[in-house]
């Protein structure tokens, strides 16, 4: 039932953050005009991955792309691959923990590929939400040192762009979003790796025990029970003696509510 | 169409008040910036201000801070500068204009001018 | 405070003429960003309030004549009118609208003889 739980919101946190970190991947608001005081000029900049824009004060908003690759500062390029690498991470691991879910029943899948799986994708979500947050980081470093030396533009040079303006750049929302999602897929990953250990079956082998009842014998060949996955094409073991101790029917085949997230 | 259409002529005394109105039609009074120009006789042009009447925001020159406030009224869709401590150096016309959109932050539009005469 | 400086202070053209006004600003009025000039141009003719010409220092305003053209960036720009109407008698001002507080040059009457 924990389990259950810890995988459950796992997954739900990784998702929320993958849905962050694409968020924040698409924003153009990774810097921004900085307004301390008084705003000094009547636009207002601001910058993307992707594209700056200007924002007039009627509300007017023009924005243009960053249409040349090369001329590019290699660190921009840089924070759009870590970026893009943990989108695709987290896509990839959503997609798997998706499948690896204790409450999703796929054909006859062991509850031992079910565990690998929710590691797997455990595993994919720390390292999604660590290129986001590395990506993040490296932006605002590039933010803050050139805040600093109070470089007119972050991409001086760039696209045949002129110096002209000193115009100081601090950071957008974008970054924070980017921050506060790649910290939830980390999270959500370290739980999805928590769910996991629960996951694992435990190879617990039952020494042979034999009950007589009435004149007859029968007996439970051991090897004893793994962890069912409640579906597939598994031989009914059926009550013969009560002692307490249930069917695989009654134990797994119907879900309980608290096995839902 | 666009248009705004300011208050008639002050004369007023020394050290006194005044309010000049520019009621506005023909677009969503809400949406665009309201600027006031200043222009003492045979002289050229000297912005005092802007105001956003959807917001309420307002930005002046230094030279005119505390000079002038600037307001308006939406029900009405009016502006309203009002001058303070007059001295013979606030005569002059001043003009409300409204900022257009998608203009690089030019005036689009021009109320008449409103003349005021500080004189005792 | 931005300072516009325009030139001449007035010039007397007869009809039909090229004329050229020019303004100066004392910071660029380049945005880097778009990579538009945030200058505009006024016209005023006599016992009227200005009315708008030019923006984004080339940018014509709707209804405004193909005579007129404005250029330059940074800080350097001109205004020039390709045939010179009768209808052009006016002062024609340049506007910084680009840094607080915006501000205006000081004018260019144009004459006409």
């Known amino acids: 039932m924990a389990v259950t739980a810890c995988q459950g919101l796992g997954f739900v946190v990784s998702l929320i953050g993958i849905a962050g970190i694409i968020a924040a991947t698409c924003m153009d608001q990774w810097s921004t005009q900085d307004l301390y005081n008084n705003p000094v000029t009547a636009v207002f900049n601001y910058q993307g991955l992707w594209r700056s824009c200007v924002r007039e004060s009627s509300g007017f908003t023009e924005c243009r792309g960053y249409f040349t690759l090369l001329g590019l500062p290699a660190m921009l390029q840089a924070v759009r691959a870590l970026m893009i690498v943990g989108i695709v991470l987290g896509a990839i691991g959503l997609l798997v923990s998706i499948f690896a879910l204790k409450c999703i029943r796929i054909g006859s899948m062991e509850d031992s590929a079910k565990a690998n799986m929710t590691l797997t994708s455990g595993i994919m979500f720390i390292v999604s939400g660590l290129c986001a947050i590395a990506g993040v980081s490296v932006f605002a470093n590039m933010l803050v040192t050139n805040f600093w030396m109070s470089t007119a533009n972050m991409y001086t040079g760039m696209g045949g762009m002129v110096q002209t303006v000193q115009t100081r750049y601090t950071f957008g929302a974008a970054l924070f979003v980017g921050w506060v999602a790649g910290g939830l897929t980390l999270i959500g990953g370290v739980m999805m790796c928590i769910a996991c250990r629960g996951l694992a079956p435990e190879e617990t082998n039952y020494k042979a025990v034999s009950y007589h009842a009435s004149g007859h014998s029968v007996a439970y060949k051991p090897g004893g029970f793994k962890a069912s996955t409640g579906f597939g094409s598994n031989t009914k073991n059926k009550k013969i003696y009560d002692g307490g101790a249930r069917t695989e029917d009654e134990v797994q085949s119907y879900p309980s509510k608290h096995d839902y997230v | 169409q666009v248009q705004l259409k300011q208050s008639g002529a002050e004369l007023v005394r020394p050290g006194a008040s005044v309010s000049l109105s520019c009621k506005t039609s023909g677009y969503i009074f809400t949406s665009y910036w309201i600027h006031w120009v200043k222009q003492r006789s045979g002289q050229g042009l000297e912005w005092i201000g802007r105001f956003y009447p959807g917001t309420g925001t307002a930005y002046y020159n230094e030279n005119f801070e505390g000079k002038a406030t600037l307001t308006a009224d939406r029900s009405s869709s009016t502006a309203y500068m009002q001058l303070s401590s007059l001295k013979s150096d606030d005569s002059a016309v001043y003009f409300c204009?409204?900022?257009?959109?998608?203009?690089?932050?030019?005036?689009?539009?021009w109320g008449q001018g409103t003349s005021v005469t500080v004189s005792s | 405070d931005i300072v516009m400086t325009q030139s001449p202070s007035s010039l007397t053209v007869t009809t039909g003429e090229k004329v050229t006004l020019s303004c100066k600003s004392s910071?660029?009025?380049?945005?880097?960003?778009?990579?538009?000039?945030?200058l505009t141009w006024y016209q005023q003719k006599s016992g009227q309030p200005p009315e708008l010409l030019i923006y984004w220092a080339s940018t014509r305003e709707s209804g405004v004549p193909d005579r007129f053209t404005g250029s330059g960036s940074g800080t350097d720009f001109t205004l020039t009118v390709s045939s010179v109407q009768a209808e052009d008698l006016a002062v024609y001002y340049c506007?910084?609208?680009?840094?607080?507080?915006?501000?205006f040059g000081g004018g260019t009457k144009l004459e006409i003889k």
């Open positions: 506007q910084n609208d680009y840094y607080f507080p915006f501000t």
């Open positions: 910071q660029s009025l380049l945005n880097s960003g778009n990579q538009k000039n945030y």
């Open positions: 204009t409204r900022e257009g959109y998608g203009k690089g932050n030019a005036m689009d539009y």
